[in-house]
Interface confidence: low
């Protein structure tokens, strides 16, 4: 999946299986990523687990679990708030669109989380205070916390190299290792589809093009669009909303704030 | 143990906003508390040792004494809860300040710096 980190780095990761997205004293978020097509390096999020840890007079431990085709509007125990403590309503889950869009507000840690199902896969977005982001017991063990550190270099897909190939007249086989992708989805069509929803040619737009060329699944256009929309709602600095690629000096680590 | 059901029914019956009951609401509030107490008694056998259950029982006793509610008296009819418009606070009036990050943060310093992380697509 594509990852925008807390430090506004933008990466395309091929991480497969379960990976920690956030792991701090208050909150644990884990995603499970699966290959989008047989033989493809590209993966998308098929499962998401959020654990809100027990906190003072505010909330009991609450677990939220979403999977493909199952986006619940309640925590695993059936509740919609933080439990039975005085401040239980400082954690609240709201269904925005049934089966498609859920928002979780954790006021006790100043955090808002948006989970969506777009097509077959899940998207995740969070707004969190720096103080909460950095509230970790043991800094040394936080190496693979994706939202903070990003993906390991060997798990990143070189977005720009892919794009350079895709822009050439014939699409190389490497761009799409799976025969399932329809040959009738040329680069120009992908660009047109993405331009419709994402008029600014930023990294969300580039991600959209990459996804369409890799999978042929137009739902990924919406995934990029909603990721940007959620960013508009959740990012505190509107000037940094659109990310643009750096020059070619940084292989594998595409991005940073404009 | 159906304590969560008792809790949610009580909150539904009493969440008319973020304020404590006004003096003319007290009879209604006491009736809701008595209903809450009745609900906890009905589920008592299956809730032995459940911390949420014992917290509720203590909480009811505290609220009954705070609002001078008599143990005997009318109970409230369960009512369908109408959700407040989006953006309205549904936080209980006794929610500690520590459970509202921004409120407790502003006491000590300027507004917090927020960060954003997102994951999408392939």
């Amino acid at each position: 999946p594509h990852l925008r980190t807390f430090t506004d780095h933008f990466q395309t990761c091929k991480v497969q299986g379960a990976w920690p997205l956030i792991d701090n004293n208050y909150l644990n978020v884990q995603v499970t990523n699966t290959p989008v097509l047989p033989g493809s390096a590209a993966t998308a999020t098929s499962k998401l687990t959020i654990i809100f840890k027990n906190f003072q007079e505010c909330v009991d431990q609450k677990v939220y679990q979403a999977e493909m085709d199952e986006l619940p509007s309640a925590f695993a125990d059936g509740s919609k708030n933080g439990g039975d403590k005085h401040g239980a309503n400082s954690l609240k889950i709201t269904e925005k669109v049934s089966g498609q869009h859920v928002e979780i507000q954790a006021k006790y840690i100043g955090t808002t989380i948006v989970v969506r199902q777009v097509g077959r896969y899940l998207t995740f977005a969070v707004r969190m205070p720096e103080e909460v982001v950095n509230a970790v017991e043991d800094r040394d063990s936080q190496g693979l916390y994706l939202c903070l550190r990003g993906c390991p270099l060997n798990q990143q897909i070189d977005f720009q190299a892919f794009r350079a190939n895709a822009e050439s007249p014939r699409r190389p086989a490497a761009a799409s290792p799976s025969p399932v992708v329809p040959e009738t989805f040329p680069y120009e069509t992908a660009v047109a589809k993405c331009k419709e929803k994402l008029p600014v040619e930023d990294l969300y737009y580039q991600a959209c093009v990459f996804d369409l060329l890799t999978t042929g699944d137009v739902n990924f256009t919406l995934a990029a669009y909603y990721a940007l929309e959620d960013g508009k709602m959740l990012h505190s600095n509107k000037d940094k909303l659109h990310l643009f690629e750096r020059t070619r000096e940084l292989p594998g680590a595409v991005a940073a704030a404009a | 143990c159906k304590i969560l059901k008792c809790n949610s029914e009580f909150w539904s019956a009493t969440s008319s906003g973020s304020h404590a009951p006004a003096s003319d609401d007290v009879p209604e509030f006491c009736a809701a508390l008595r209903t809450y107490a009745l609900c906890t008694r009905r589920t008592a056998r299956t809730c032995r040792g459940d911390l949420a259950y014992h917290s509720a029982v203590h909480g009811i006793e505290d609220l009954m004494s705070q609002h001078n509610c008599s143990k005997d008296g009318p109970t409230s009819q369960p009512r369908v809860r109408t959700l407040p418009p989006a953006g309205d606070s549904q936080e209980r009036s006794d929610s500690p300040e520590i459970c509202h990050y921004e409120k407790s943060f502003h006491k000590h310093s300027a507004a917090p710096n927020y960060t954003h992380c997102g994951l999408f697509g392939d």
């Epitope: 004293n25 644990n28 654990i51 840890k53 027990n54 906190f55 003072q56 007079e57 009991d60 431990q61 677990v63 695993a76 403590k85 005085h86 | 143990c1 040792g49 459940d50 911390l51 949420a52 917290s55 203590h58 500690p96 520590i98």
Partner: antibody, heavy 120, light 109 residues
Framework: EVQLVQSGAEVKKPGASVKVSCKAS????????ISWVRQAPGQGLDWMGW????????NYAQKLQGRVTMTTDTSTSTAYMELSSLRSEDTAVYYC?????????????WGQGTLVTVSS | QSALTQPRSVSGSPGQSVTISCTGT?????????VSWYQQHPGKAPKLMLY???KRPSGVPDRFSGSKSGNTASLTISGLQAEDEADYYC?????????FGGGTKVTVL
């Protein structure tokens, strides 16, 4: 250094009450809960309950309901556990422990223990 | 009767590995990230060894590790040393007030 220092050993008669104190230092007292745990001679650990110094909220073990009272004094950063109607089976070492983040979370700092002997 | 079941005793020679299990229910162990482990030497207060199933507080040697599978949490001591001989207790919140396991005596042969 984070420390919990408990009051000294007590000998009580059946039917009496005992009040054990636990003085905290080295951290913000109201930021963590205090749990009380006891251990009868040769037996395992037995959770008695929890108190939040921040709000005074308590959770007591079912079997001790009505006999145990936990309180705190934030001005002196001290937690208290009072057990009434003592019986011989209450003979135990009583520990206070700081709770990491909430009532049921891990106990990261422990007091040295207070031996309470109930004997006629 | 404890809601968390531990073996009464385990033993091993110095340098060997031993594993202590702690079996509960789905709510007490299976779905919980709050399993912690305590070491207690005779006549001493318990000491936190692991929390959140796998995390080690500073000062605890890395030969102590934790894991969880289904409704069973485990504490493993690899490279057993003489000073590891003690009682070990697991602890978890289960929605009830029986939170400690019965304890396991670890003997270093």
């Amino acid at each position: 250094e984070v420390q919990l220092v408990q009051s000294g050993a007590e000998v009580k008669k059946p039917g009496a009450s005992v009040k054990v104190s636990c003085k905290a230092s080295g951290y913000t007292f109201t930021s963590h809960g205090i749990s009380w745990v006891r251990q009868a001679p040769g037996q395992g650990l037995d959770w008695m309950g929890w108190i939040s110094p921040y709000s005074g909220n308590t959770n007591y073990a079912q079997k001790l309901q009505g006999r145990v009272t936990m309180t705190t004094d934030t001005s002196t950063s001290t937690a208290y556990m009072e057990l009434s109607s003592l019986r011989s089976e209450d003979t135990a070492v009583y520990y206070c422990a700081r709770v990491g983040s909430g009532p049921y979370y891990y106990m990261d700092v422990w007091g040295q223990g207070t031996l309470v002997t109930v004997s006629s | 009767q404890s809601a968390l079941t531990q073996p009464r005793s385990v033993s091993g020679s110095p340098g060997q590995s031993v594993t202590i299990s702690c079996t509960g229910t789905s709510s007490s162990v299976g779905d919980s990230i709050y399993v912690s482990w305590y070491q207690q030497h005779p006549g001493k207060a318990p000491k936190l060894m692991l929390y959140d199933v796998t995390k080690r507080p500073s000062g605890v040697p890395d030969r102590f590790s934790g894991s969880k599978s289904g409704n069973t949490a485990s504490l493993t001591i690899s490279g057993l040393q003489a000073e590891d001989e003690a009682d070990y207790y697991c602890y978890s919140y289960a929605g009830t007030d029986t939170l400690f396991g019965g304890g396991t005596k670890v003997t270093v042969l």
